[in-house]
Interface confidence: low
């Protein structure tokens, strides 16, 4: 069919709650493209009717909610004027036994986020919620071992749970919960987070090393397209998140409306002792407001930035 397969993504998900996956692959999805979702190589596209339990919402596929029978491989086809790319997403649906102690509390599935708090420090946990604009998320509640978290040491700030003076007792099974509203109906979104405690400064005893960028400036002409890679080496068993931020906000969130600046899909190369990760940032069109602003690559506790600057005028042309 002439479409190029880009990659396969595996997701293990909880039944009975919403799930969304966004078909983005900068810079391919940045231009004039059409995005269509299919299930299990079906020739019939996923419905775009918002009342459908499973439907396409712009570039997203949205499940309201996931059900057992939704397991399978979904394809997202990105068609440009002269190109066709396909992303495969393998979804596996499980029933989670959230609070049934006889089953052992939160299950250790791969859709759970493993996060680390640093002993004696002020630290935070993050609730990762990714849904299209049609979904309105209410305030986030946090639970530990199925009890709502309360107390002076804990503060909820947007999608984060701030924990002051982390103690050994803070390890355990957490969950963040939000009520999602879509077309007047409400659903529960629940993410399990397994939290461990470390005394070391780095994550898992190793601080990720950002090879590039190196806190430097890049000369770039106004109006041009720019792609910058963030290259990170880290241990094979690391649980660090790698991302690009501006003004302490994920670039995909900061430029949510215009989508002018986007974070790419992370890739990695495996070596014997470590992994080399790459996640890029794409500026579809550099604007004046981008100059002088630090664009930060984050990898666990490590950060490095680039600053765009206008090239010095070339007086030889005169």
């Amino acid at each position: 069919d002439g479409c190029k397969d880009i990659f396969m993504k595996n997701e293990i998900l909880s039944a009975s709650q919403p799930f969304a996956f966004n078909c983005t692959f900068p810079p391919i999805t940045s231009g004039e493209v059409s995005v269509t979702w299919y299930k299990n190589s079906s020739k019939i596209p996923v419905s775009k009717i918002i009342q459908s339990r499973i439907h396409q919402d712009e570039t997203w596929i949205l499940f309201l909610p996931m059900e057992w029978g939704d397991s399978g491989v979904y394809q997202c086809v990105i068609k440009g004027r002269d190109s066709c790319h396909r992303i495969h997403v393998n979804l596996t649906v499980f029933e989670k036994h959230w609070c049934d102690t006889s089953i052992g509390g939160l299950p250790n599935l791969s859709d759970e986020y493993k996060q680390i708090l640093h002993l004696g420090k002020d630290d935070s946990l993050t609730c990762h919620l990714h849904f299209p604009k049609s979904c309105v998320l209410g305030p986030i509640k946090w639970y530990k071992d199925c009890n709502e978290i309360k107390g002076e040491r804990f503060t909820v700030l947007e999608t984060r749970l701030l924990v002051s003076n982390v103690s050994a007792e803070d390890r355990g099974n957490y969950a963040c919960q939000a009520i999602l509203t879509h077309s007047g109906k409400q659903y529960e979104v629940l993410n399990g987070i397994t939290v461990s405690i470390t005394e070391r400064a780095g994550y898992g005893g190793s601080v990720p090393k950002i090879i590039y960028p190196k806190n430097h400036s890049i000369e770039v002409q106004l109006g041009t397209t720019l792609i910058v890679d963030c290259n990170v080496t880290d241990t094979k068993d690391n649980t660090n998140l790698r991302c690009w931020r501006v003004n302490n906000t994920l670039v995909d969130d900061y430029y949510d409306e215009s989508k002018r600046i986007r974070e790419g899909v992370e890739t990695h190369v495996s070596f014997r002792e470590h992994n080399l990760y790459t996640v890029n940032i794409t500026f579809l069109e550099v604007k004046m407001e981008d100059y002088g602003l630090p664009f930060m690559c984050h990898a666990g506790v490590s950060t490095a930035y680039i600053i765009l600057q206008l090239p010095a005028p070339d007086f030889r042309a005169y």
Epitope: S16, L64, H97, W98, C99, D100, E148, A175, E188, L190
Partner: nanobody, 128 residues
Framework: DVQLVESGGGLVQPGGSLRLSCAAS????????LGWYRQAPGKQREAVAT????????YYSDSVKGRFTISQDNAKTTVYLQMNSLRAEDTAVYYC?????????????????????SGQGTLVTVSS
């Protein structure tokens, strides 16, 4: 709109049995937590029994453990409360409720009532 309709209440002698049913309509999705709470005249409401949306987790208050059983039909749109060995102190209006959160404390017998929808109630009277 979501509606919860209870049935099966009535007058029963001590030691007798009743089966309450709650039919949920208007759902386009499976609720996370269905269950029953009761309120006797002049008393605090009490979570009696709850079942998670998948039917995988149940909760019973200490006062009904071993006597009451909560269950769902296969379509998960009706929830039942089988009440055996009824006592005078079980006399109350029984309400069906549907909660959005499987982690809501109500789902596990907590005192905060985080259910989203509630029915009109059905009266259960245990008397000789």
């Amino acid at each position: 709109d979501v509606q919860l309709v209870e049935s099966g209440g009535g007058l029963v002698q001590p030691g007798g049995s009743l089966r309450l049913s709650c039919a949920a309509s208007g759902y386009s999705y499976r609720t996370q937590c269905l269950g029953w709470y009761r309120q006797a005249p002049g008393k605090q409401r009490e979570a009696v029994a709850t079942i998670s949306g998948g039917g995988t987790s149940t909760y019973y208050s200490d006062s009904v453990k071993g006597r009451f059983t909560i269950s769902q039909d296969n379509a998960k749109t009706t929830v039942y409360l089988q009440m055996n060995s009824l006592r005078a102190e079980d006399t109350a209006v029984y309400y069906c409720a549907a909660g959005l959160s499987v982690l809501g404390s109500w789902c596990h017998g907590g005192s905060s009532y985080e259910y989203t929808y509630s029915g009109q109630g059905t009266l259960v009277t245990v008397s000789s």
